[in-house]
């Protein structure tokens, strides 16, 4: 029963992680540049995402624009986009496998096959988690590097956006969920032995009598 609870918890965490990756992918807040000038016309915040950028004026107006082409996206965000999309697809596969291998589903009859499927699902979630943590951490590294680079103009210095924190949370959930599912060991195939043992015992008992 404890194994069942662990499995449900693992799946739940991984699914939450998968949803968080989608949110991280969709939110246009990977990098944030704020210009707080002496003047409200030029005081604005620029959000950069994987799909669009947004300009938020100090007056509260927000204008978002989808990137015209893939080339409009900086190289690090191009790579991040690719990895995050792959991560979403991989995590979706993990969800599918975890449903198939779930103790409370009847997709597979064999308990051993179910357990193995669940371990594969766990590994898949771990992979998805790694695929998220890499671009998120790389983007954060670049932002921090530029922030302390004296050659980068202060107006060009970006800050870490909410998407990066969501991304770290997502990878944490996927890694944790995947780890719990990998702990789901397959049952030992000792049924034949126990059957032989009980047969031997009953035979011995009848001889004694």
């Amino acid at each position: 029963m404890a194994s069942m609870g662990l499995q449900v918890m693992g799946i739940a965490l991984a699914v939450l992680g998968w949803l968080a990756v989608m949110l991280c992918c969709a939110l246009p807040m990977w990098r944030v540049t704020a210009f707080i000038g002496s003047n409200i016309v030029t005081s604005q915040t620029i959000w950069e995402g994987l799909w669009m950028n947004c300009v938020v004026q100090s007056t509260g107006q927000m204008q978002c624009k989808v990137y015209d082409s893939l080339l409009a996206l900086p190289q690090d965000l191009q790579a991040a986009r690719a990895l995050v999309i792959i991560s979403i697809i991989v995590a979706a596969l993990g969800v599918l496998l975890s449903v198939v291998g779930g103790k409370c589903t009847n997709c597979l009859e064999d308990e051993s096959a179910k357990a193995k499927t669940m371990i594969v699902a766990g590994v898949v979630f771990l992979l998805a988690g790694l695929m998220v943590i890499v671009p998120v951490s790389w983007t954060a590294h670049n932002i921090i590097q530029d922030f302390y680079n004296p050659l980068v103009a202060s107006g060009q210095k970006r800050e870490m956006g909410a998407s990066l924190y969501v991304g770290w949370a997502a990878s944490g959930l996927l890694l944790l969920g995947g780890g719990l599912l990998c702990c789901n060991c397959p049952p030992r195939t000792d049924k034949p032995y126990s059957a032989k043992y009980s047969a031997a015992r009953s035979a011995a008992a009848s001889n004694y009598v």
């Epitope: 003047n39 409200i40 016309v41 030029t42 300009v55 004026q57 007056t59 107006q61 996206l73 900086p74």
Partner: antibody
Framework: EVQLVESGGGLVQPKGSLKLSCAAS????????MSWVRQAPGKGLDLVAD??????????YYADSVKDRFTISRDDSQSMVYLQMDNLKTEDTALYYC??????????WGQGVMVTVSS | DIVLTQSPALAVSPGQRATISCRAS??????????MNWYQQKPGQQPKLLIY???NLDSGIPTRFSGSGSGTDFTLTIDPVQADDIATYYC?????????FGSGTKLEIK
């Protein structure tokens, strides 16, 4: 539709004072920053001053050429913007426009009011 | 301050394409966001916002108007030009304080 109507312009002597008013309608005045932009005869446009909305603490900005001489203010209850101009100089002669701030620019403009500084 | 340079005048025949340029003394773009606006001022009238963020048409502006460019070079295109388009066109940046305007390009019809 955004409507801005300026008033208070006229002829004034150097070192004199004048107060321009701008009545706004057709939009949620409380949510927008407002500004005064001027255009000297036959010349281009120059931002004179701007003021943010209440949510941004009514922050103000003044062009270097008018600092300590001009004061921008607003009255949200009346949807009015004002420009108090003191110690006027001949180079302040221009058409003064009241403009609403939008997208890092000026989205709605009044017809303008002429200010002539001459002895 | 960022200086915006525009050519003083441009003469175009009706039905033709008019291309008005604006060059900034330094980049007015950040992270593929182009902080440049365009205005039209007809004789004796107040200016009117045409395009914001270099390429976004303000509401109610005909699709004959379009904007492009990034970094330091920006273009306002009117295609096709109509007699009603006689005006002075100004560019304005919001990259840093103070926001400045170009000197304006007067569009004349041949």
């Amino acid at each position: 539709e955004v409507q801005l109507v300026e008033s208070g312009g006229g002829l004034v002597q150097p070192k004199g004072s004048l107060k321009l008013s701008c009545a706004a309608s057709g939009f949620d005045f409380n949510s927008y920053g407002m500004s005064w932009v001027r255009q000297a005869p036959g010349k281009g446009l120059d931002l004179v001053a701007d003021i943010s909305s209440k949510s941004y603490s009514y922050a103000t900005y003044y062009a270097d050429s008018v600092k300590d001489r001009f004061t921008i203010s607003r009255d949200d209850s009346q949807s009015m913007v004002y420009l108090q101009m003191d110690n006027l100089k001949t180079e302040d002669t221009a058409l003064y426009y009241c403009a609403m701030i939008l997208y890092g620019g000026f989205g709605g403009w009044g017809q303008g009011v002429m200010v002539t500084v001459s002895s | 301050d960022i200086v915006l340079t525009q050519s003083p005048a441009l003469a175009v025949s009706p039905g033709q394409r008019a291309t008005i340029s604006c060059r900034a003394s330094q980049s007015v773009s950040i992270s593929s966001v182009n902080l440049m606006n365009w205005y039209q001022q007809k004789p004796g009238q107040q200016p009117k916002l045409l395009i914001y963020h270099a390429s976004n048409l303000d509401s109610g502006i005909p699709t004959r108007f379009s904007g492009s460019g990034s970094g330091t070079d920006f273009t306002l295109t009117i295609d096709p030009v109509q007699a009603d388009d006689i005006a002075t066109y100004y560019c304005q940046h919001s990259r840093e304080s103070p926001p400045t305007f170009g000197s304006g390009t007067k569009l004349e019809i041949k």
